[in-house]
Interface confidence: low
């Protein structure tokens, strides 16, 4: 390999290097490649040089396109007709000189916050692009359409947020915002101007016309209308609070809808239980006043007893299933019918047949094993399933089992 590289001179974006050739293994070196490494790079990376192509008789080159105020080390790799050789030992580590910052913060945005606040956020400039010590940000903002910019200096490279608080800031009003950069060398550019809205006011009116109905023992559907009166504060969605009659309201669970949806389903509830529900509008500032509370009782739970005494027999491409009627207990929903679930043994998707009888006839090909289960259904939902029944592949036309 070539002998270790020497850094002869370094500027903010360039480094002049020299090296002595190593042994060529009896095949002349045709070119050299320069590689660089920084604390921020993943391993060694090829860099641009002047001359762009370094022939085998050249032992000096200038690396260009470096980042200011970054620690670099360099090495060379020699190549000949046989291939690429071992890299040289790395040079000493040297830091490029400082320069004015050139990269502006990305994703300047903001919004939200508390009353009378303008929240401005941005992505910090990575350390390797700060170009010098003493890096910081200049936050500039003005009410949309006004002439004069207000400026705030944040002398911290880690700053990613600025909050302007003033009673004169109206809720959800637009501001033009830009964020500039500076370091010890001076001020750099500003980001493009973007529009950010001040903190909004939480909704001031409650939703109207709350109505809830029980769908099953476990599910409730809630409906409401957007506030009837003129509401201040943008509505981003609604929050539905629900709690059991025997629980405290502060233990209520909450679910949120997004957008102008004015109904939602609440699931995983207990059967035969009185629930209280209330709805609020919300936005980024918080929630508005609560609607009146409505009450709804979930339906009785579905039958807990599974269908029993299941008998099957087959004839003429049919499987006939019979089972005992399921009787609902006093605290259970009345049986409305039965669901017969079946699938091929090799197939994961399940087919369902509903019947209000205690028997069913399935027309199925006989060259497969079947898995069958039966469960009652009711207003309270589906009841307990029977044990799975495996009906084996039937080679003859008649078979029976239980």
């Amino acid at each position: 390999p070539p002998e270790a590289v020497t850094i002869d001179e370094i500027t903010d974006t360039t480094a002049q290097l020299s090296w002595r050739p190593g042994p060529d293994n009896h095949s002349p070196i045709t070119m050299y490649v320069i590689q660089a490494r920084t604390p921020f790079s993943v391993g060694w990376q090829a860099v641009s040089t002047v001359p762009e192509l370094i022939d085998g008789k050249t032992f000096t080159a200038t690396v260009v396109g470096l980042n200011p105020w970054v620690e670099y080390e360099f090495r060379t790799v020699a190549a000949n007709v046989i291939g690429i050789g071992e890299p040289s030992r790395p040079s000493e580590k040297r830091r490029t000189e400082e320069a004015l910052p050139e990269v502006t913060p990305a994703n300047v945005s903001g919004g939200g916050g508390s009353k009378s606040e303008l929240v401005i956020t941005w992505e910090t400039v990575p350390e390797e692009l700060q170009n010098g010590r003493g890096f910081g940000y200049v936050v500039a903002f003005r009410p949309y359409g006004k002439m004069i910019w207000m400026l705030t200096v944040l002398a911290s490279a880690d700053a990613s947020r600025y909050v302007f608080r003033n009673e004169s800031v109206h809720p959800f009003s637009p501001f033009e915002v830009k964020v500039g950069v500076f370091n010890n060398k001076g001020e750099g550019p500003f980001s493009p101007t973007t529009v950010v809205y001040s903190a909004e006011e939480e909704p001031t009116k409650p939703p109207a016309s709350i109505f809830a109905r029980s769908l099953s023992a476990t599910d409730i559907e809630v409906f409401w209308a957007s506030p009837l009166e003129k509401n201040r504060g943008r509505i981003q969605g609604y929050e539905v609070k629900y709690w059991r009659h025997e629980d405290k309201e502060e233990n209520a669970r909450k679910i949120r809808t997004v957008g102008n949806q004015t109904s939602t389903k609440i699931t995983n509830l207990k059967g035969s239980v009185l629930y209280h529900l209330a709805v609020k509008a919300y936005n980024s500032a918080g929630t508005g006043p609560s609607s009146a509370t409505v009450n709804v009782t979930t339906r009785k739970p579905p039958p807990s007893q599974p269908p029993g005494n299941i008998i099957w027999n087959s004839s003429d491409s049919k499987i006939i299933l019979n089972w005992d009627q399921v009787k609902a207990l006093d605290n259970e929903s009345e049986v409305k019918g039965y669901k017969v679930l079946y699938r091929w043994n090799r197939q994961s998707s399940t087919s369902v047949i509903e019947t209000n009888k205690t028997s069913v006839e399935l027309s199925l090909p006989f060259d497969e094993d079947y898995i069958i289960e039966i469960k009652p259904f009711s207003d309270g939902g589906d009841g307990s399933s029977s044990e799975q029944i495996r009906i084996p592949k039937i080679s003859n036309a008649y078979a029976r089992g239980s």
Epitope: S114, E250, K254, I255
Partner: antibody, heavy 123, light 107 residues
């Protein structure tokens, strides 16, 4: 039983990057918010970062915002904290924690904690 | 920031109340959690979450309440093994935070 096991923190150099992984078991991982909380020697608890069950929302304390990234792999039931540009004040014990409910979030809702892993940032 | 007293003390069997204030109305509620730490560097234990919910393995002498912007942890019939630092957790208007901790000494 819920268990939260943090990877070893160890000695880190200032300006470097720290990656901590918490392996969770005993609950439906993808349903719960997960947290990183730290404690400097002789100091109190400090909220660091939080991630929603699906991973779509993240929250950070101002002290680490811009330096920290919290992420999760629901397939592996792991949550990761990446903390860059380490400082001496990042020294402390880092705890992984989970939210108590699938519907609540924030520093008021933690119900389970890992044993913690010690991180020392020093040159 | 959340504010809590730096220390409280009580005799065994007495009732202790630790308060936490400074929480901000956040997404429809003031929420506080309470976390017990028996020695620095040992894992905290949740005694109350979301104002008044107690994990199943926590004794019933621990209870919590939230009234406006103040949360309260109550230990009814304090015992020697309850001696620890108690931290409240909540939202202070800009970020989720923990209080500085209250040292409970059982005399």
């Amino acid at each position: 039983a819920v268990t939260l096991d943090e990877s070893e923190g160890g000695l880190q150099t200032p300006g470097g990057a720290l990656s901590l992984v918490c392996k969770a078991s005993g609950f439906t991982f993808s349903s719960f918010n997960m947290f990183w909380v730290r404690q400097a020697p002789g100091k109190g608890l400090e909220y660091v970062a939080e991630i929603s069950g699906g991973g779509g929302s993240t929250w950070y304390a101002p002290a680490v915002k811009g330096r920290a990234t919290i992420s999760r792999d629901n397939g592996q039931s792991t949550v990761r904290l990446q903390l860059n540009n380490l400082r001496a004040e990042d020294t402390g014990t880092y705890y992984c924690a989970k939210s108590a409910d699938t519907w609540s979030y924030g520093a008021a809702t933690i119900d389970a904690w890992g044993h913690g892993t010690e991180v020392i940032v020093s040159s | 920031a959340l504010t809590q007293p730096s220390s409280v003390s009580a005799n065994p069997g007495e009732t202790v109340k630790i308060t936490c204030s400074g929480g901000t109305y956040s997404y429809g509620n003031y929420y506080y959690g309470w976390y017990q730490q028996k020695s620095p560097g040992s894992a905290p234990v949740t005694v109350i979450y979301n104002n008044n919910n107690r994990p199943s393995d926590i004794p019933s002498r621990f209870s919590g309440s939230g009234s406006g912007s103040t949360g309260t942890l109550t230990i009814t019939g304090v015992r020697a093994e309850d001696e620890a630092v108690y931290y409240c957790g909540g939202y202070d208007g800009s970020t989720d935070v923990f209080g500085a901790g209250t040292t409970l000494t059982v005399l």
